[in-house]
Interface confidence: low
């Protein structure tokens, strides 16, 4: 008869991450007694995959029930495949000896490569603000994929831009790849609206890419632009300076009232109007009692937008000589009025 | 949420026979080696027996010959035929899930009980 | 099969204690020792596999050492919640076999 010989008829295999592998092998004789076992690598490190004589191997199916007598075929199962499994794997005949068996002859082996997807695109946005024409990084992160080859582009509102840097590593070769790519987008003041989308195209992805996106809300701030006037009034001695804050964003504004550089009052933005770009509108007034004032008024709305430095804008304040003549013995404050809002200027 | 669920425990007299049933959910069964674990009242953790993914049996020595553990993959549930009871097989019987790499017992049912008396 | 001795059976200690169970082997079981703890009227819950590795959702001041025969469960700060029964176990071949239980208790 024949000596024995262990047959691997592929060369390679290739398997989506999650799917079972089969793997294999047929023997061409029941001679030499012994069993037969799987490896993953070859040499002194080789792990042990199956053994047909005892232990307990839970992913591990026989193709074939090997406890009859007249079965030579030998393949494996190996399920819920990750990239940690590929390898070359061996078809190994022992030969039963003691104190152990033997190794009598090895398959030529079969190479199991992993095709994982790559994980959803994880878009991160710089951490801090920036305003308008100022330039912001945007990075997108994607792990676990194989084979190495990956594709990604990067869009703003749809728009694909070219000013990125990707990275794939390692740069050798690995069970899994992961991939970073830095994008510089430059701001705009419609930019509250707007989106910077990550899109990653693999092999495993059957031409439906990932897409990762941010919010340029989470990375723009456009300062308010202001302006204060001065509204007409019926009475004679009173006046009514508006403050308009106009096409800020994020929210958060303060808004301080001097007169004469002291401070009159402070009040927090709360019923805001929204432009259709995405920014707000508010506005503040403050009604003068102009008896309380011998002297021309300087009025100045300042303003304090998302921690930033504030900016002001003053008006000043005609006290006419009739209201001077009759106003000198008055000295009570002036009356404030509540903020009321204005129209959006879209 | 992975769960196992366990039922079919009840009252039989000695040389009877009874079913457990363990209902899973959360995951495929069959991809996972599955176990019948027992615990006498007051008493210690006793394996019985176990199914693999590829169908393969084992038992402990004192129920061989009189229990059999099968699965229905399309009811994703377990089963432990007992026949032959005595007494010494009351415990309550929990149904365990092995873990996929090693097979260590991850997820636990919150067991059935099995009252042999006459 | 392989026989598995804890030890001790019972233990009294107190809250922000550090304890040490035992579990020793009949014979070599590689790494293939688990750990579970059950609580009165209670399934066991699964704390450790492969004699050192913590289940999901099991908190830190559990750990596991040992290969071969000889295996340790320290609870590193006992916490009310900890006071239980703890059971070892083998399961590198058939019929799993479990030790016969560590009642901790509150001292």
């Known amino acids: 008869e024949d000596e024995l010989q262990v047959i691997q008829p592929e060369k390679s295999v290739s398997v989506a991450a999650g799917e079972s592998a089969t793997l294999r092998c047929a023997m061409t004789s029941l001679i030499p007694v012994g069993p037969i076992m799987w490896f993953r690598g070859a040499g002194a490190g080789r792990e042990l995959i199956y053994n047909q004589k005892e232990g307990h191997f839970p992913r591990v199916t026989t193709v074939s029930e090997l406890t009859k007598r007249n079965n030579l075929d030998f393949s494996i199962s190996i399920s819920n495949i990750t990239p940690a499994d590929a390898g070359t794997y061996y078809c190994v005949k022992f030969r039963k000896g003691s104190p152990d068996d033997v190794e009598f002859k090895s398959g030529a082996g079969t190479e199991l490569s992993v095709r994982a997807k790559p994980s959803a695109p994880v878009v991160s946005g710089p951490a801090v603000r920036a305003t308008p024409e100022h330039t912001v990084s945007f990075t997108c992160e994607s792990h676990g994929f194989s084979p190495r080859d990956i594709t990604l582009k990067w869009f703003k509102n749809g728009n694909e831009l070219s000013d990125f840097q990707t990275n794939v590593d390692p740069a050798g070769d690995s069970v899994s790849y992961s991939i970073h790519s830095t994008a510089r987008v430059v701001l705009t003041r419609g930019d509250v609206h707007s989106q910077v989308i990550c899109e990653i195209a693999h092999i495993t992805l059957q031409g439906d890419p990932l897409r990762g996106t941010a919010n340029l809300s989470e990375a723009i701030r456009v300062p308010p632009t202001l302006e204060v006037t001065q509204q007409p009034m019926r009475a004679e001695n009173q006046a009514n300076v508006t403050c308009q804050v106009s096409n800020f964003y994020p929210r958060g504004l303060q808004l301080t009232w001097l007169e004469n550089g002291n401070v009159s009052r402070t009040e927090t933005a709360s019923t805001l109007i929204e432009n259709k770009d995405g920014t707000y509108n508010w506005m503040s007034w403050l009604l003068v009692n102009t008896c309380a004032h011998r002297d021309d008024v300087v009025l100045t709305c300042q303003v304090e937008h998302d921690g930033q430095q504030a900016v002001s804008k003053s008006y000043a304040l005609e006290i006419s000589a009739h209201q001077k003549e009759h106003g000198s013995d008055i000295t009570h404050e002036a009356a404030l009025a509540p903020t009321a809002p204005l129209g959006g200027s879209g | 949420e992975v769960q196992l669920v366990e039922s079919g425990g009840g009252l039989v007299q000695p040389g009877g026979s009874l079913r457990l049933s363990c209902a899973a959910s959360?995951?495929?069964?069959?991809?996972?080696?599955m176990h019948w674990v027992r615990q006498a009242t007051g008493k210690g953790l006793e394996w019985v027996s176990a199914i693999g993914t590829a169908g393969d049996t084992y038992y402990t020595g004192s129920v061989k010959g009189r229990f059999t553990i099968s699965r229905e993959n399309a009811k994703n549930s377990l089963y432990l035929q007992m026949n032959s009871l005595r007494a010494a097989d009351t415990a309550v019987y929990y149904c365990v899930r092995g873990g996929v790499w090693d097979d260590a017992f991850d997820i636990w049912g919150q067991g059935t009980m099995v009252t042999v008396s006459s | 099969d392989i026989q598995m001795t804890q030890s001790p059976s019972s233990l009294s200690a107190s809250v922000g204690d550090r304890v040490t169970i035992t579990c020793r082997a009949s014979?070599?079981?590689?790494?293939?020792l688990a750990w579970f703890q059950q609580k009165p009227g209670k399934a066991p819950k699964s704390l450790i596999y492969t004699a050192s590795s913590l289940h999901s959702g099991v908190p830190s001041k559990f750990s596991g050492s040992g290969s071969g025969t000889d295996f340790t469960l320290t609870i590193s700060s006992l916490q009310p919640e900890d006071f239980a029964t703890y059971y070892c176990q083998q399961y590198v071949s058939y019929p799993y076999t479990f030790g016969q239980g560590t009642k901790l208790e509150i001292k």
């Open positions: 959360g995951f495929t069964l069959s991809s996972y080696d």
């Open positions: 014979q070599d079981i590689n790494n293939y």
